[in-house]
Interface confidence: low
């Protein structure tokens, strides 16, 4: 009979850019841990062997960190990181318990185009100026017909390339796992989340290798 | 479509080294990792190790380490495996496959370890 | 080290049955990280189902797999004469990271 509980942070919010600490604690089991498997949706993160150590899946290594103890580091937080994550303790004589964390990455409050936050006062006053300096610019370049063919010509190629990026850059966050083409996937959508490629969805494995960080710590509580 | 094609069987002398290439082709090679597989009558089917060609990443088995060593060239799609310290018992066929679910093989490439 | 007992080890059927091949795991392991394979003499393994019940692409919907924990089926539910191989179930997660059953021959009675 399974005993055990696995104890998570639950559901957690970090910001865009920054880290998080996914932790999972068993207790109320005197059962013998032998791996823990750290997944998000169907793609293995990394995985704590109570013989081998650590494995990071090398398509996360630069932004996944193992630890502290059984918990795992996310750095260089991005919105496609948003989604459900998953500590899969693999015991005996238990057999498996799993635990869910669900993590929403937030954009930075100046880089959010949403209404959903609020722009703090500084970025108001930034943005004021700004609109304020373009319009000024706008109307003394006017006067010159020369300059104003120029500014419209560069007006022109900026709309381009915000058109451009917008391509890659979609406001509602994919979801984790959602990072399907193979070919020719732009760095923005596909290099932020899977590291240096972008591996098909069914990939699973994505090769562990192996850290050579001492042997994972495997402690329960009986109580 | 998907091949991997692997390079002709090998006849060694004990102590030798030899190493075999799985070259790939029909996919875009630094997105999946390239597993090797060896295949005995009395072992069956061994898990070698494996490399994610995007970052040269690698993994092995641990009763691999020091016998199988994994190397890939990304300009020519091509996934290596050398074998040192050659024994009778490395006499086997060795099997590349294509990632974490093996969907699709190598021809195989046999090696023979005789004096 | 997860070991993969695969029973039994030789299976006599005739084409028409339906064939049951088991697996089982020494501990229990991810339903996602289960597949089947086909070989057949002089030939490389062929993947037929990954993720313990998905057809692999081209494999004819006669196979089927199931299971969870530490027990997996492979059930094909009329053998046709192309049938007749071994065949071998394949778990990754465990240490080492990937290893195979020693494979189920399925002959002809």
């Known amino acids: 009979m399974m005993t055990g509980t696995i104890e998570t942070t639950g559901n957690i919010s970090a910001e865009k850019g920054g880290s998080i600490i996914l932790q999972c604690h068993l207790s109320s089991t005197t059962a013998q841990v032998t791996q823990v498997n750290w997944e998000q949706q169907d793609q293995l993160l990394a995985i704590c062997n109570a013989d081998l150590g650590w494995h990071i899946s090398p398509s996360f290594k630069d932004r996944v960190a193992p630890g502290p103890g059984l918990g795992l580091t996310l750095q260089s937080l991005t919105v496609n990181d948003t989604g459900e994550y998953f500590c899969i303790y693999h015991t005996y004589p238990d057999g498996t318990y799993t635990g869910r964390i669900f993590l929403e990455v937030l954009e930075s409050s100046v880089a959010e185009h949403g209404a959903r936050f609020q722009i703090p006062l500084l970025g108001a006053m930034a943005a004021t100026l700004v609109v304020i300096c373009t319009a000024v610019i706008v109307v003394v370049a006017l006067t010159r017909k020369k300059k104003a063919l120029r500014i419209h010509s560069v007006e022109g190629d900026l709309r381009r390339k915000s058109a451009g990026q917008e391509e890659w850059s979609p406001s509602a966050p994919s979801p984790p796992g959602s990072c399907v083409q193979a070919e020719a996937a732009p760095a923005g959508l596909c290099g932020e989340q899977r590291g240096e490629d972008c591996a098909e969805l069914h990939d699973y494995f994505n090769v562990l290798s192996y850290r050579s960080l001492g042997n994972c710590s495997f402690f329960t509580e009986t109580g | 479509q998907v091949q991997l094609v692997q390079s002709g069987a090998e006849v060694k002398k004990p102590g030798a080294s030899v190493k075999v290439s799985c070259k790939a082709s029909g996919y875009t090679f630094t997105s999946y990792n390239v597993h090797w597989v060896k295949q005995t009558p009395g072992q069956g089917l061994e898990w070698i190790g494996t490399?994610?060609?995007?970052?040269?990443?690698?993994s092995y088995n641990q009763k691999f380490k020091g016998k199988a060593t994994l190397t890939a060239d990304k300009s020519t799609s091509t996934v290596y495996m050398e074998l040192s310290s050659l024994r009778s018992e490395d006499t086997a066929v060795y099997y590349c496959?294509?990632?974490?679910?093996?969907?699709?093989w190598g021809q195989g490439t046999t090696v023979t370890v005789s004096s | 080290e997860i070991v993969l007992t695969q029973s039994p080890g030789t299976l006599s059927l005739s084409p028409g049955e339906r064939a049951t091949l088991s697996c089982r795991a020494s501990?229990?392991?991810?339903?996602?990280?289960l597949h089947w394979y086909q070989q057949k003499p002089g030939a490389s393994p062929k993947l037929l189902i990954y993720n313990t019940q998905n057809l692999a692409s081209g494999i004819p919907d006669r196979f089927s797999g199931s299971g969870s924990g530490t027990s997996y089926t492979l059930t094909i539910s009329r053998l046709e004469p192309e049938d007749f191989a071994v065949y071998y179930c394949q778990q990754f997660g465990g240490y080492p990271l990937i290893t195979f059953g020693a494979g189920t021959k399925l002959e002809l009675k």
């Open positions: 496959a294509r990632s974490g679910t093996m969907d699709y």
């Open positions: 501990s229990s392991i991810s339903s996602t990280y």
């Open positions: 490399i994610y060609p995007g970052n040269l990443a690698t």
